[in-house]
Interface confidence: medium
């Protein structure tokens, strides 16, 4: 996962009118593993911002060494700093625990740019702000590493919670998230609510702020309006999900669904942008362009080089359109749509000139790998990810930033037809080719 | 309507001085970033100063570098180029131009892609 600016085809889209709603089955949301209501002592346990990561504070060893790390959906690593390193105010100390074991192995992480590596052992865990129970867990202690830390974030390591299949150095090393469920009575569902600011932090901001929330072990229903929605989580590896259409302002993008797709489609806090094969960004920018015509915009702006400014409060959210996202659904022919609003998609950043002027950049970026949902989609929903039932669930978050005429939306049942032919088959290869 | 006009071209010997205007208006509700560009007969448009930095400093072409002095003057929403020791090779159109962005990164938003808004232009002749 990249932190930061990361980390024979069919339509699928043929029958009834994505219009035509079906009837819901029951007006009761579908139960729920572990408890539902209210996780008082896990609400607001998150800080930071999208473009440098949301972090969770966490213990590790005897006595516990307090940690902030970093909230990552999009791998499957627990790894935190266990050496100085410039951007580093503390890191894990190992030879101060008691508890420690070291599995006399080394673990080596290459991203697109950037890397880190360190050495395996293992050690007791646990989340001040969550469950109040410890864990016998696997940490990678990063020794060495290039590009992955980020001055001024406030995390020193990496919690990842997708599933064993993406863990380095392969998926005999259990992820933490993985540990806590078979040592615990904790249930295997997780549910995460990042509020983005909606305007710059600085970091003193950052540190006084809320972030959001990560509930271990349920639904938390006060987070959340509405209906929770549930797409099917595809494969067990990253969180992967099916997307089935896609909208700018209600308008059709009308692409083969699988291009959506291509290679996947995956849910990921610890990337910042929402990402976009480039087939589908290009379309998307170009209709994006279109409904916001009122503005030239120049083309480092689209390509999220430039920064676009106004005089502070007159951001012209109105000129810009919201994005539509249909998601299969968990009935057979049924999707439903998460709807985007510009105040997520454009990231507010400190200008370097002046305070007088609100500026953003363009939060929709290119990708080689496929769908990225990141931290500019997840601000606008609570996100479940729903391991026991294999589903990740949406609705609309109770922080998302919006404006008094337009909110983000989480909207269904629709008809969508032929949806199975809108994933793509990766083909299997014997070496991995993994570059997260 | 976001309208830029420009004044103050003409002709002018080698070695002397010219001082352009460009007047913005209908900037209702933000701030553009101005700059100026111009186009020799047969060659491309090209950026000769810009202040689209978000850092507000101002790139120069190399060829005027030394030369050329661009400024702004907020309240009277007019951008000025400074034209000294002019050289034939000066001899173009020069246009006002409105970036939407400044470049967060400290390169220069230097190319007429990245330009929203154009003035008509002035010309300016330098004779040996």
């Known amino acids: 996962t990249q932190h930061g600016i990361r980390l024979p085809l069919r339509s699928g889209l043929g029958g009834a009118p994505l219009g035509l709603r079906l009837p819901r089955e029951t007006d009761e949301e579908p139960e729920e593993p572990g408890r539902r209501g209210s996780f008082v002592e896990m609400v607001d346990n998150l800080r930071g911002k999208s473009g440098q990561g949301y972090y969770v504070e966490m213990t590790v060893g005897s006595p516990p060494q307090t940690l902030n790390i970093l909230v990552d959906t999009g791998s499957s690593n627990f790894a935190v700093g266990a050496a100085p390193h410039p951007f580093l105010h503390r890191y894990y100390q190992r030879q101060l625990s008691s508890t420690y074991r070291d599995l006399r192995k080394g673990v080596y992480v290459p991203y697109t740019q950037g890397k880190w590596e360190g050495e395996l052992g293992t050690d007791l865990v646990s989340i001040p702000h969550g469950p109040n129970v410890t864990v016998r867990a696997n940490i990678a202690a990063i020794t060495e590493s290039d590009k992955f830390f980020i001055n001024g974030s406030n995390w020193e390591g990496i919690l990842g919670l997708a599933y064993a299949e993406i863990a380095r150095p392969d998926d005999s090393l259990e992820p933490f998230f993985d540990s806590l469920v078979k040592q615990t009575h904790v249930p295997n569902l997780f549910s995460l609510q990042l509020c983005g600011a909606g305007f710059p932090l600085n970091q003193s901001e950052v540190l006084a702020s809320v972030g959001g929330s990560m509930i271990i072990g349920g639904i938390d229903h006060s987070l959340y309006t509405g209906s929770l929605w549930y797409t099917p989580i595809r494969r067990e590896w990253y969180y992967e999900v099916i997307i089935v259409r896609v909208e700018i302002n209600g308008q059709d993008l009308k692409m083969d669904c699988k291009e959506y797709n291509y290679d996947k489609s995956i849910v990921d806090s610890g990337t910042t942008n929402l990402r976009l094969p480039k087939k589908v960004f290009e379309a998307a920018v170009k209709s994006i362009k279109a409904a916001s015509s009122t503005e030239k915009f120049p083309d480092g702006f689209w390509l999220g080089e430039q920064l676009v400014c106004w005089q502070a409060g007159t951001t012209p959210w109105n000129i810009f359109p919201v994005i539509s996202l249909y998601l299969m659904g968990e009935v057979t022919n049924q999707s439903f749509r998460i709807t985007i609003l510009p105040q997520q998609y454009l990231r507010p950043v400190e200008d370097v000139a002046t305070s007088q002027d609100d500026c953003y950049k363009f939060a929709i970026s290119q990708s080689s790998t496929g769908t990225v949902m990141g931290a500019v989609i997840m601000e606008g929903f609570y996100v479940v990810f729903d391991r026991a039932r294999k589903r990740i669930g949406f609705a609309v978050s109770a922080c998302h930033v919006h404006d008094e005429f337009r909110t983000a939306a989480v909207e269904g049942p629709f008809v969508t037809l032929d949806m199975e032919d809108c994933g793509y088959n990766i083909p299997q290869t014997d070496e991995s080719t993994l570059m997260t | 309507d976001v309208q830029l006009q420009e004044s103050g071209g003409g002709s002018v010997q080698a070695g002397g001085s010219l001082r352009l205007s460009c007047v913005a208006s209908g900037f209702t509700y933000r701030r553009y970033f101005m700059g100026w560009f111009r186009q020799a007969p047969g060659k491309e448009r090209e950026a000769v100063a810009t202040m689209f930095s978000c850092g507000g400093t101002t790139y120069y072409a190399d060829s005027v570098k030394g030369r050329f002095t661009a400024t702004q003057d907020n309240a009277k929403n007019t951008v000025y180029l400074q034209m000294n020791n002019l050289k034939p090779e000066d001899t173009a159109i020069y246009y006002c131009?409105?970036?939407?962005?400044?470049?967060?990164?400290?390169?220069?938003?230097?190319?007429?892609?990245?330009?929203?808004?154009w003035g008509h232009g002035t010309q300016v002749t330098v004779s040996s």
């Open positions: 131009a409105a970036a939407s962005g400044c470049w967060y990164d400290g390169s220069p938003a230097a190319r007429s892609v990245d330009v929203s808004f």
